[in-house]
């Protein structure tokens, strides 16, 4: 990963010198490549059963896998997760706010992994090797340029990808009504590898 | 902001001691509060005129304002931006890839700012003071709890907010066909402050 933090990129471009500081390609690629990045996640998306309650804050900062891989058959997925427990304010209607503990899954280590069966039927396998391995398909381009593309944000939010071969997440725990730690329905995370979006569980 | 980076949260929760390290409320709040956070942004969303070309990587890491404010009438918006120029590979159909320089806008400083005219007609202004100022509206809760909520991710992606009083962005530059940097039509950014989503330009 690049040595220059993004905070410095912001300031380097307009420093008044005639030679604008250009972030070199390898560094741009490195920062866009598959990794765990801090992301704000809606509490209720992680705890859908709590939809009738309100939390403050209503979103929490978690590390989630995101970024590009070098091939459209590869997707950025978590290969190691860990639980983190946070204290939030819960508002029960008509009652004063009170603290609760909620446990979330964080992505600790990310890798580019194959999603089996992703090869399009109209693209013969022996033809794929000729395509650039760092580009995504775009309909307006000729066949040669529609083979393998490492990363496409556009439209990825709504696309549903097949399950990636990702180790099943550490099951998340949350307080059950009976007081014992209750295992959430394991999210056999049909990871939607957000090719440059966030890898979030499909529900 | 909290001293503990999120990377450490991931590892602290399972340390085997009976006293699990729970991230305290003020720290959780601090990390969810309005700030500039690194985010992967689709190149073509920033350069829509380049939709017929392909870039590698197709997304770049930029600092963008995101997070919660203490009131649903406040939104996390950039109050200072700066340009950053990056080197990417551009693929023109039938041609070999070549480096180009693209300039992007980063959010340097974020603030919670009022979005005028956001008060719902069914919520009288004099009633608002009684409501918790750190909670978002949820239909299932009584009126008292639907007044002011600092942060709601859910649905925010599709909601269109009025323009925030944000300084106009530094116009972005990108290489023109003639090789000289060509000024993009300035994006009088109707900022969509993504209450816990990313503040991204509306187009």
């Amino acid at each position: 990963l690049p040595a220059v933090p993004p905070q410095q990129w912001a300031l380097s471009a307009g420093n008044g010198s005639s030679e604008v500081e250009v972030v070199p390609f390898q560094e741009v690629w490195g920062r866009s490549y598959c990794r765990a990045l801090e992301r704000l996640v809606d509490v209720v998306s992680e705890y859908p059963s709590e939809v009738e309650h309100m939390f403050s804050p209503s979103c929490v900062s978690l590390l989630r896998c995101t970024g590009c891989c070098g091939d459209e058959n590869l997707h950025c997925v978590p290969v190691e997760t860990a639980n983190v427990t946070m204290q939030l304010l819960k508002i029960r209607s008509g009652d004063r706010p009170s603290y609760v503990e909620l446990t979330f899954s964080q992505h600790v280590r990310c890798e580019c992994r194959h999603s089996p069966g992703r090869q399009s039927p109209d693209m013969p396998g022996d033809f794929r090797a000729d395509a650039p391995s760092f580009l995504p398909p775009r309909r307006s381009l000729p066949m040669l340029f529609r083979m393998e593309w490492g990363c496409a944000l556009t439209g990825s939010q709504s696309a549903v990808w097949p399950s990636s071969p990702v180790p099943e997440e550490i099951p998340r725990m949350h307080p059950g009504r009976n007081g014992k730690k209750q295992q959430r329905k394991p999210l056999r995370e049909k990871m939607k590898p957000e090719r440059c979006g966030d890898a979030v569980p499909r529900r | 902001l909290p001293a503990v980076p999120p990377q450490q949260w991931a590892l602290s929760a399972g340390n085997g001691s009976s006293e699990v390290e729970v991230v305290p409320f003020q720290e959780v709040w601090g990390r969810s509060y309005c700030r500039a956070l690194e985010r992967l942004v689709d190149v073509v969303s920033e350069y829509p005129s380049e939709v017929e070309h392909m870039f590698s990587p197709s997304c770049v890491s930029l600092l963008r304002c995101t997070g919660c404010c203490g009131d649903e009438n406040l939104h996390c918006v950039p109050v200072e931006t700066a340009n950053v120029t990056m080197q990417l590979l551009k693929i023109r159909s039938g041609d070999r890839p070549s480096y180009v320089e693209l300039t992007f806008s980063q959010h340097v400083r974020c603030e919670c700012r009022h979005s005028p005219g956001r008060q719902s007609p069914d919520m009288p202004g004099d009633f608002r003071a009684d409501a918790p100022s750190f909670l978002p509206p949820r239909r299932s809760l009584p009126m008292l709890f639907r007044m002011e909520w600092g942060c709601a991710l859910t649905g925010s992606q599709s909601a269109v907010w009025p323009s925030s009083p944000v300084p106009e962005e530094i116009p972005r530059m990108h290489p023109g066909r003639n090789g000289k940097k060509q000024q993009r039509k300035p994006l009088r950014e109707k900022m969509k402050p993504e209450r816990c989503g990313d503040a991204v330009p509306r187009r």
Partner: antibody, heavy 116, light 112 residues
Framework: QVQLQQSGAELVKPGASVKISCKAS????????INWVKLAPGQGLEWIGW????????KYNEKFKGKATLTIDTSSSTAYMQLSSLTSEDTAVYFC?????????WGQGTLLTVSS | DIVLTQSPDSLAVSLGERVTMNCKSS????????????LAWYQQKPGQSPKLLIY???TRESGVPDRFTGSGSGTDFTLTISSVQAEDVAVYYC????????FGSGTKLEIK
């Protein structure tokens, strides 16, 4: 209605241990923190620690680490505080209290007297 | 650790009088984003358990008479009883919950 019923007064010898109980009723036990507070004669209130029955997680005031141990039994909706290596300094009324960040329901208190 | 200093230690007033007591924190208890101060006031009558009066520095707990008012923000807080009644004889504690919990030393209210 919400109630926290604490065990009765205790007279114990120095060096011994004692376990005070707090039985909760009238609400879902696992949804709210249980805190423990000390009120020593002629002193003010001191927070000892909390336990979150939904997870069993605990947090202690540094001053009471090694002195107090908080546990729960969710099947009986009961919280416990064990105090060890007792000295005269531990003579006090101990309260269990529901909720955080604001303590809304208090037990009636358990008087612990440490004397030889 | 956050230290809360209450003043005065004790005060004696006549029935119907207005009384104020103070609580000063060694650091700000204000969560500026929420615009809430994590401070509460408790009343402990002789031989009883403490009772929550005020939270968020100024929000009155349900059932608490409106003669009790909390004010202040950040580091300086005040509890005011507009017209003291005989049943208000008690020790009043402030408590911070910004970082864990600490109580002030208490202010003892007596009737002259």
């Amino acid at each position: 209605q919400v109630q926290l019923q604490q065990s009765g007064a205790e007279l114990v010898k120095p060096g011994a241990s004692v376990k005070i109980s707090c039985k909760a009723s009238g609400y879902t036990f696992t949804d709210y923190y249980i805190n423990w507070v000390k009120l020593a004669p002629g002193q003010g209130l001191e927070w000892i620690g909390w336990i979150y029955p939904g997870s069993g997680n605990t947090k202690y005031n540094e001053k009471f680490k090694g002195k107090a141990t908080l546990t729960i039994d969710t099947s009986s909706s009961t919280a416990y505080m064990q105090l060890s290596s007792l000295t005269s300094e531990d003579t006090a009324v101990y309260f269990c209290v529901r909720d955080s960040p604001f303590f809304d329901y208090w037990g009636q208190g358990t008087l612990l007297t440490v004397s030889s | 650790d956050i230290v809360l200093t209450q003043s005065p230690d004790s005060l004696a007033v006549s029935l119907g009088e207005r009384v104020t007591m103070n609580c000063k924190s060694s650091q700000s208890l204000l969560n500026s984003g929420m615009r809430k101060s994590f401070l509460a006031w408790y009343q402990q009558k002789p031989g009883q358990s403490p009772k929550l009066l005020i939270y968020w520095a100024s929000t009155r707990e349900s059932g608490v008479p409106d003669r009790f008012t909390g004010s202040g923000s950040g580091t300086d807080f005040t509890l005011t009883i507009s017209s003291v009644q005989a049943e208000d004889v008690a020790v009043y504690y402030c408590k911070q919950s910004y970082h864990l919990f600490t109580f002030g030393s208490g202010t003892k209210l007596e009737i002259k």
